[in-house]
């Protein structure tokens, strides 16, 4: 038994036929010693007398509000809730399994940007006697603050004969660092109480993995002379992180008729305009995705082809900041080749994702995961890799990136990746390894020496451990190279001489 909040207690029960239940001792919160009686809920039947009441809790009939009285006066209440465990698994009767992205997904969360603000939602078919409370933190062993509002009913839907209710909550990380590479996941805990049943649900994620931008805004069409082509332009959504030269998006532009089965024109671009073929009854749709990290695509923003009227040109991706401030104190006193670094880091992003696409069936955040990922270098808040830090002095950040590149390059060449089980012959790990080396050499030409971090002894003994470690390292590398790519893109746009 444990206290959920003042005067509310949760009794944890193994739930099987003829289970003995739990013995619970309730104590009346009063200085009085005698003449005390106990009742349950609205019943006037006296269950016992004295300052304490011992009960055997086996089923929901034993739960409820226990009240102690003296001479017609209520002294205190204790509400007992039951938390069922069947076959070693806690019950999940209150919320509906959303089955996306995998089974047993009860909470789903999304973030529109990297500000540390996110929304979580869940579904239930229960309409009454239902309360939720939400807590969140970053990390679990030394948690950092995340503030969540109250859960509210956000939608009602009819699904066949049933009504389905969607609840949502907004949370904000107290000290968010949008440019940093997250090393500890956000933990979200939802307590759900339906009548006398208690359940808890948890979700663990990095903001980067739940990013879903808002759709692009201000779609405009401009027909091109003597052609069936039109130029479509758009802008970054207002809710996306700035500056856009650092937090860049990539876009998918699609022209299609009303039916999904109809033929289409489709093109991908990093710019905020594209030229497509527009048929009479079709519409043009554009959606956005983080350019350097493969999180969710936005919903589509659409405009009918027939409305090719207004012709404002495509607006640029804004927020590039001031012109070419000189880089200080890079080894040898020279600036890195920002544009070359940008191209190679973007290639690294692509390779890191093709080496390890999102593994839907494998939950890589298992026990001890905080320790494993702490062994690899992360680009942290104080490393100067944010746009302001880069403008002030990019050397700190470049040094940090260089350390990370060397670290991952050594890891990819180590026994973890060369040992059994052998990598598939078509694995891009070899290319990834070479590209990491290439970028580190661009950053630090021969003869200059920055300190490099020691490679920890991550030597797994079993092939399955090696496999798991590969997944974890590649997932971590994806996050690292995404931040590096943002740094170089921003540098190329704003710091290049």
């Amino acid at each position: 038994i444990w206290e959920l909040k003042k005067d509310v207690y949760v009794v944890e029960l193994d739930w099987y036929p003829d289970a003995p239940g739990e013995m619970v001792v309730l104590t009346c919160d009063t200085p009085e010693e005698d003449g005390i009686t106990w009742t349950l809920d609205q019943s006037s039947e006296v269950l016992g007398s004295g300052k304490t009441l011992t009960i055997q809790v086996k089923e929901f009939g034993d739960a409820g509000q226990y009240t102690c009285h003296k001479g017609g006066e209520v002294l205190s209440h204790s509400l007992l809730l039951l938390h069922k465990k069947e076959d070693g698994i806690w019950s999940t009767d209150i919320l509906k399994d959303q089955k996306e992205p995998k089974n047993k997904t009860f909470l789903r969360c999304e973030a529109k940007n990297y500000s540390g603000r996110f929304t979580c939602w869940w579904l239930t078919t229960i309409s009454t006697d239902l309360t939720f409370s939400v807590k969140s933190s970053r990390g679990s062993s030394d948690p950092q603050g995340v503030t969540c509002g109250a859960a509210t009913l956000s939608a009602e839907r009819v699904r066949g004969d049933n009504k389905e209710y969607e609840y949502s909550v907004e949370c904000q990380e107290d000290s968010a660092c949008p440019a940093a590479e997250e090393s500890l996941p956000i933990e979200v805990m939802v307590d759900a109480v339906h009548k006398l049943k208690y359940e808890n649900y948890t979700s663990s994620f990095f903001i980067r993995d739940i990013i879903k931008p808002d759709p692009p805004k201000n779609l405009q069409l401009k027909p091109l002379k003597n052609s069936r082509q039109v130029e479509v332009s758009w802008e970054y959504p207002d809710t996306w992180s700035t500056p856009h030269s650092y937090f860049s998006l990539t876009f998918c532009v699609q022209v299609q008729g009303k039916s999904k089965r109809e033929k289409k024109d489709r093109v991908f671009t990093d710019k905020t305009s594209a030229t497509v073929i527009c048929a009479k009854n079709a519409s043009i749709s554009v959606r956005a995705q983080d350019r350097y990290y493969s999180s969710s695509w936005s919903e589509w923003a659409s405009v009918p082809c027939s409305g090719s009227g207004s012709s404002r040109g495509g607006s640029g991706s804004g927020g590039s900041g001031g012109g070419g401030s000189k880089l200080r104190a890079v080894p040898g006193g020279s600036s890195p080749a920002w544009t070359q670094c940008q191209q190679l880091s973007q290639k690294l992003c692509t390779l890191a994702w093709s080496a390890h696409p999102l593994v839907g069936h494998m939950d890589l955040r298992e026990e001890g995961d905080e320790e494993t990922t702490n062994d690899v270098p992360h680009i942290q808040c104080g490393d100067g890799c944010d746009p302001q830090g880069l403008r002030d002095n990019s050397q700190f950040c470049l040094q940090r990136i260089h350390q990370g590149l060397i670290f991952y390059e050594k890891l990819l060449g180590s026994d973890i990746f060369t040992g059994e089980p052998s990598l598939l012959p078509d694995s891009p790990v070899g290319q990834l390894h070479a590209s990491l080396l290439g970028l580190s050499q661009l950053l630090q030409p021969e003869g200059h020496h920055w300190e490099t971090q020691q490679i920890p002894s991550l030597s797994p003994s079993q092939p399955w451990q090696r496999l798991l470690l590969r997944f974890k390292i590649l997932r971590s590398l994806q996050a690292f190279v995404a931040v590096a790519a943002r740094v170089f893109a921003h540098g190329a746009a704003t710091l290049s001489p």
Partner: antibody, heavy 118, light 107 residues
Framework: QVQLVQSGAEVKKPGASVKVSCKAS????????LHWVRQAPGQGLEWMGW????????EYAPKFQGRVTMTTDTSTSTAYMELRSLRSDDTAVYYC???????????WGQGTMVTVSS | EIVMTQSPATLSVSPGERATLSCRAS??????LHWYQQKPGQAPRLLIY???QSISGIPARFSGSGSGTEFTLTISSLQSEDFAVYYC?????????FGGGTKVEIK
């Protein structure tokens, strides 16, 4: 399954015209874009243009503009490509191909060899 | 127009070995890049679309990667039926253009 069958080989004199046909089957003709791509002997591939059989819309590569005409006959599910003012360097295998997506080529015809020689 | 350059022009590989084919665009084309295989006397066939998307029915040993201006087609372990000419094609803008091709021949 989707299939494209092209007309037979042609030999033409310089200055003449050629009209190659491409008969589609295994799908609703108007549901796919149709492209024409050619390949000179021992050379690479060269895109000529596309047609949308649903409405007759076309887009030609600038190199062929004014010299090529692409048409379709929906009643027979057949596409045609006519190339005029033939020169010896038009000697090539001409392929038709079809796809629901406009910008790449999924299903190819077997090709039609057109030889331009005096 | 966008110029596509493939390298090498000819690649000599032993059966069972890995082959890596490169394609470079004259300007950034995002992931609007497709790969085809052509055997002598046959029409080309689509292998990979949008840089890395695989086609059903195409063996898993064919994989594509890249974005921007540099792209790679990898054949992990060459089989006898893979000796052919491979073309890349950009779909970023019209006119659609192909690379000059890479001939993969038996070493």
């Amino acid at each position: 399954q989707v299939q494209l069958v092209q007309s037979g080989a042609e030999v033409k004199k310089p200055g003449a015209s050629v009209k190659v046909s491409c008969k589609a089957s295994g799908y609703t003709f108007t549901d796919y874009y149709l492209h024409w791509v050619r390949q000179a002997p021992g050379q690479g591939l060269e895109w000529m243009g596309w047609i949308d059989p649903e409405n007759g819309d076309t887009e030609y590569a600038p190199k062929f503009q004014g010299r090529v005409t692409m048409t379709t006959d929906t009643s027979t599910s057949t596409a045609y490509m006519e190339l005029r003012s033939l020169r010896s360097d038009d000697t090539a295998v001409y392929y038709c191909n079809a796809n629901k997506e406009l910008r790449y080529f999924d299903v190819w015809g077997q090709g039609t060899m057109v030889t331009v020689s005096s | 127009e966008i110029v596509m350059t493939q390298s090498p022009a000819t690649l000599s590989v032993s059966p069972g070995e890995r082959a890596t084919l490169s394609c470079r665009a004259s300007q950034s084309i995002s992931i609007n890049l497709h790969w085809y295989q052509q055997k002598p006397g046959q029409a080309p066939r689509l292998l990979i679309y949008f840089a890395s998307q695989s086609i059903s029915g195409i063996p898993a040993r064919f994989s594509g990667s890249g974005s921007g201006t540099e792209f790679t087609l990898t054949i992990s372990s060459l089989q006898s039926e893979d000796f052919a000419v491979y073309y890349c094609q950009q779909s970023n803008s019209f006119p659609l253009t192909f690379g000059g091709g890479t001939k993969v021949e038996i070493k």
